[in-house]
């Protein structure tokens, strides 16, 4: 009996036309929501004038439905047993699951003003940019609607820059009508232990963002893992959102709608400094802001964002060093609310429920040639927003899963 089940599982998790896995893989049957909380700055003038602590108040959730589009350009390669695809991006606002509308306004860091002196560090260019910032009446902080902040707005300062650059700014701009990929993953036909593992991303086996092994694309995309998952296994996956591969370790056993699943969690040491976790040395690419690589809990992904000073962390700087959160008031990190987890059904390796939580921050530094930033006495890693992307197997699908998989094993 067990051999037959194993054989069936091995057949059904292969990523090729006709299998259970393939059908769910092409277009997820799970409804995926992405909730946003925006950090509304309460004392913008005080910060800009006196370099005070930044007082923030989170507002949310503002919920969007995401990952509802099927994978496209699916191409099997029988030679190397891979399948390639792109994942289209789309987001639909869900008013009934939100505290307000997309037109709600927030006071947030002025993304363009903060990024400009970081990208252009020489003083001639900064003097030029300063004159344009002043001319456009831009300052360190700005008021923007949710829609503008997330999906893009025409920046008045960048619109004055006298050479061709993108003048549209947004945390996720561009998003709708874009694709993530090309991904090329093993289909598992020749070796089931490699199923869904990424072979290459955008035509490359490495990212070109990090030195050494940190640059590797490891594991799957976290939607599924090779079958027969053991608690002792470290689940490795690549997240294009954070421009790196990461891992999860077994946390607990959970009953999900009658299906026994393993909850894998992102451990704190994944965000540790090289001092605490030497394996992370190659994620520290800058010595000043990181206090000589002793700070932890924030990841500088600037290289992956055209040099913009973008830092990724867990929400509310969970698992981050005190020096990171000290200049910010109003953060309340909480393990349950702010950690990331994957609930994986161990026989199939399918992720049946997940919560991906991350925070987007922007570094702003004193810039003596930029009037809007010249009074700052220290750098700040400023939280802009945090998100919670969740998906749970539907009741019908869960019943079907129990009948076809876990029921048979019992």
């Amino acid at each position: 009996g067990d051999m037959l089940i194993e054989k069936t599982i091995k057949r059904e998790v292969v990523l090729e036309e006709g299998t259970t896995a393939f059908k769910n893989w092409v277009k997820t049957g799970t409804t995926v929501y992405r909730q946003f909380w925006i950090f509304d700055v309460q004392n913008p003038d005080d910060v800009a004038k006196n370099s005070s602590k930044i007082k923030v108040k989170q507002r949310g959730p503002y919920t969007y439905r995401v990952r509802y589009l099927a994978k496209e350009n699916i191409t099997q390669d029988p030679e190397d047993h891979t399948v390639s695809f792109v994942q289209p991006n789309g987001a639909i606002f869900e008013p009934s699951l939100s505290v307000g509308t997309e037109d709600d306004n927030f006071t947030v860091l002025n993304l363009a003003v903060a990024a400009a002196p970081h990208i252009y560090q020489n003083s001639f260019v900064q003097v030029v940019l300063n004159s344009l910032i002043k001319k456009s009446k831009s300052s360190m902080f700005q008021t923007r609607s949710l829609k503008e902040l997330l999906w893009g707005y025409k920046d008045p300062f960048l619109s004055l820059v006298p050479y061709p650059i993108s003048t549209t700014v947004g945390v996720f701009y561009p998003y709708n009508d874009t694709v993530d990929g090309v991904y090329k993953v093993f289909n598992g036909k020749d070796n089931i232990s490699k199923v869904a593992i990424i072979e290459s991303y955008k035509g490359k086996r490495n990212l070109s963002y990090w030195p050494s092994y940190c640059d590797m694309i490891n594991g799957t995309d976290a939607a599924s893992f090779p079958p027969f998952v053991e608690k002792s296994r470290t689940l490795r996956f690549f997240s294009s959102d954070i421009c790196r591969s990461i891992y999860a370790v077994f946390g607990s056993e959970i009953d999900l709608k009658g299906i026994p699943v393993y909850r894998f969690v992102l451990p704190a040491n994944a965000f540790a400094s090289p001092l605490q976790n030497p394996d992370n040395h190659c994620f520290c690419t800058e010595k000043v802001i990181s206090n000589n690589c002793t700070s932890y809990g924030v990841l500088d992904i600037g290289k992956c964002k055209e040099g913009k000073p973008v830092y990724i962390s867990l929400p509310h700087f969970l698992h981050a060093s005190p020096d990171v959160s000290e200049p910010i008031e109003g953060l309340h990190p909480n393990e349950d609310e702010h950690r990331t987890y994957l609930d994986v059904e161990p026989i199939t390796g399918f992720t049946l429920q997940f919560a991906k939580r991350l925070q987007v921050n922007i570094l702003v530094k004193p810039a003596r040639k930029i009037e809007a930033l010249k009074n700052l006495k220290r750098p700040y890693i400023v939280p802009i927003l945090w998100l919670n992307e969740t998906g749970t197997i539907g009741d019908e699908k869960a019943e079907m899963f129990k009948t076809q998989v876990t029921g048979k094993i019992k």
């Epitope: 003083s123 260019v125 050479y163 003596r368 009037e371």
Partner: antibody, heavy 119, light 107 residues
Amino acid sequence: EVQLVESGGGVVQPGESLKLSCESNEYEFPSHDMSWVRKTPERRLELVAAINSDGAITYYPDTMERRFIISRDNTKKTLYLQMSSLKSEDTAMYYCARHGQTGTWFAYWGQGTLVTVSA
Amino acid sequence: ETTVTQSPASLSMAIGEKVTIRCITSTDIDDDMNWYQQKPGEPPKLLISEGNTLRPGVPSRFSSSGYGTDFVFTIENMLSEDVADYYCLQSDNLPLTFGAGTKLELK
């Protein structure tokens, strides 16, 4: 030693055009911002135009009325100033100046080329 | 626009005397003031850059001070080779503006 050699100056009539060049002997020319500065017969120094190292960002004071265009060819290690619709008040000694490593304005200057606009 | 008022317009000093030139700006420019020397028939030469920083190779008899709107350039013991025009330049904001210059002569 940094050497900047200007050329292209001369006597022209009002309304005419002139193109100034400034050749550098520096291997690192492509990594430096550059400017044109002029000294008027009244002994006044004025910034005419500036350009960043890769030529993407240029600056002209409003007083220059967009009659001048600064450009550079990093492969030739040469800076240019295209001057059009010249007026008698453009009469001056035109210097090309290289900015310093840390962004210091006008750290090194050429010997200058004289432009005379006269009917 | 920041205007720069330089004084005096001309100065006649004897060798060994202390020379003082002043520039006042119409807006606060922190310490973004530069000082240039131009000898007859030569291009200007940067002596002191932003932050009252003496440039490499410039003799220590030259110095400057000031912050905000009031700036002073000093030659401690004047030598005959210091005969030149001296200009200040504010580089805090655009348009950059030079002072009108000070003609330093030998008494």
